[in-house]
């Protein structure tokens, strides 16, 4: 949602968190701002304090309940407002009617671990975190492997077009240090985006057996 010179973007993690970023040209100095969430069909409402993340943008997390509680559904609409204090009053800076399941960004996958490693291959598994049971199997993943002498940006993306919480990396170089990351995205939602990348998992392939080609 854009109001005046501001931009207000929020994502739902599919369970109990709405994360918002508000950016404003000609930023207000020393002003207290909040995001207010008012669902259309729930008894609760929630507020979070916007904190600066850069010169002209602020962010906050609306914690709607315990991490794995299902606080919203696809039929919910949440009115989200940015309110800033001016004098003793509050002034609305931005507003949007937020459809949570059209604006999804899941938490980064967790618990990455090496299941099995060989000289040229490595099998890695992970878990998704705080993802709604509504998705059933309608998730996709992207993964990338960091090779020595390269950057993450140069790493080719591997796409898993189904809910598959493991991958077998092949054609690896023996006795080499690698890092691996994965991210997840639901198939649902017009404005849905990829989760952040997982914490990198470092692993080393086994050395080639001596005396073998």
């Amino acid at each position: 949602a854009v109001n005046g010179t501001s931009r207000f973007t929020c994502f739902y993690n599919s369970r109990a968190n709405i994360s918002c970023v508000w950016s404003q040209d000609g930023a207000l100095q020393d002003t207290s701002c909040q995001v207010h969430a008012w669902p259309d069909r729930r008894r609760w409402n929630q507020t979070c304090e916007l904190l600066p993340v850069s010169q002209a943008s602020w962010a906050c997390n609306l914690i709607l309940g315990t991490p794995d509680s299902q606080k919203l559904t696809a039929v919910d609409i949440v009115t989200l407002r940015v309110m800033c204090r001016e004098g003793v009053r509050w002034r609305m800076m931005a507003i949007q009617d937020f459809k949570p399941f059209e604006n999804l960004r899941l938490m980064a996958p967790i618990s990455l671990q090496v299941v099995h490693v060989e000289t040229h291959r490595c099998n890695i598994s992970w878990k998704i975190s705080q993802a709604s049971h509504y998705f059933e199997r309608h998730l996709e993943f992207e993964a990338r492997t960091l090779s020595p002498g390269h950057t993450w940006e140069e790493a080719p993306l591997m796409t898993l077009k189904q809910k598959q919480e493991w991958i077998c990396l092949e054609t690896l170089t023996p006795d080499t240090q690698y890092e691996f990351q994965v991210r997840v995205k639901p198939l649902q939602g017009e404005f849905t985006t990829w989760s952040p990348w997982s914490q990198p998992l470092a692993f080393r392939t086994k050395p080639a057996a001596l005396g073998k080609d």
Partner: antibody
Framework: EVQLVQSGAEVKKPGASVKVSCKAS????????ISWVRQATGQGLEWMGE????????YYNEMFKGRVTMTRDTSISTAYMELSSLRSEDTAVYYC??????????????WGQGTTVTVSS | DVVMTQTPLSLPVTLGQPASISCRSS???????????LEWFQQRPGQSPRLLIY???NRFSGVPDRFSGSGSGTDFTLKISRVEAEDVGVYYC?????????FGGGTKVEIK
């Protein structure tokens, strides 16, 4: 019916203080802001600042900072504006006015009848 | 502070005729949220100010439709389509976009 009833006229000597009251009725006192505006004789209007009775938070126009104090007593739905170190230029009609806690549309909708303060030696 | 300048200072009008008051701000009063908090108040003789118009062109409840507001940026106008006897008084513009909020000096409307 929303009503703001202010205290009566005051005559003060230079250097003294004056405290004007504004009693609210017809709405929930702690849900709205009370602004104070003054009008010197034959002059325009000047916004002095405001108080939110819900938490007692105040904001003063720089021009009056250090001389003005706004308070409230929620038990009797009354707001007060005290102006100290009075000088002849402070001779004016002082108004209280109600405003929404969230400034969505307008600053002040309902006004008190005004209190005349005369500063004279 | 934003200085609000009104013209004319005095406006003699004939009953039933239109009247127009101008208000100019010393800087743009579009708030950073995109709204323009320009308001008009009427003060009849011996009375308290009364809100007529808010956010440039919106009439407050109970205000007759002969009152209208227009303008943008730094230039604003209050129009009375057909002046009635009860419209006599002083009219003030007010900006609520930048603290401290400020009023114009006022325009006195009187019957010729």
């Amino acid at each position: 019916e929303v009503q703001l009833v202010q205290s009566g006229a005051e005559v003060k000597k230079p250097g003294a203080s004056v405290k004007v009251s504004c009693k609210a009725s017809g709405y929930t006192f702690t849900d709205y802001v009370i602004s104070w505006v003054r009008q010197a004789t034959g002059q325009g209007l000047e916004w002095m600042g405001e108080i939110y009775p819900g938490d007692g938070n105040t904001y003063y126009n720089e021009m009056f900072k250090g001389r003005v104090t706004m308070t409230r007593d929620t038990s009797i739905s009354t707001a007060y504006m005290e102006l100290s170190s009075l000088r002849s230029e402070d001779t004016a009609v002082y108004y209280c006015a109600r405003g929404s806690y969230t400034y969505d549309n307008y600053a002040m909708d309902f006004w008190g009848q005004g209190t005349t303060v005369t500063v004279s030696s | 502070d934003v200085v609000m300048t009104q013209t004319p200072l005095s406006l003699p009008v004939t009953l039933g005729q239109p009247a127009s008051i101008s208000c100019r701000s010393s800087q743009n009063i579009v708030h950073s949220n995109g709204n323009t908090y320009l308001e008009w108040f009427q003060q009849r003789p011996g009375q308290s100010p009364r809100l007529l118009i808010y956010k440039v062109s919106n009439r407050f409840s109970g205000v007759p439709d002969r009152f209208s507001g227009s303008g943008s940026g730094t230039d604003f106008t209050l129009k009375i389509s057909r002046v009635e006897a009860e419209d006599v008084g002083v009219y003030y513009c007010f900006q609520g976009s930048h603290i401290p909020w400020t009023f114009g000096g006022g325009t006195k409307v009187e019957i010729k």
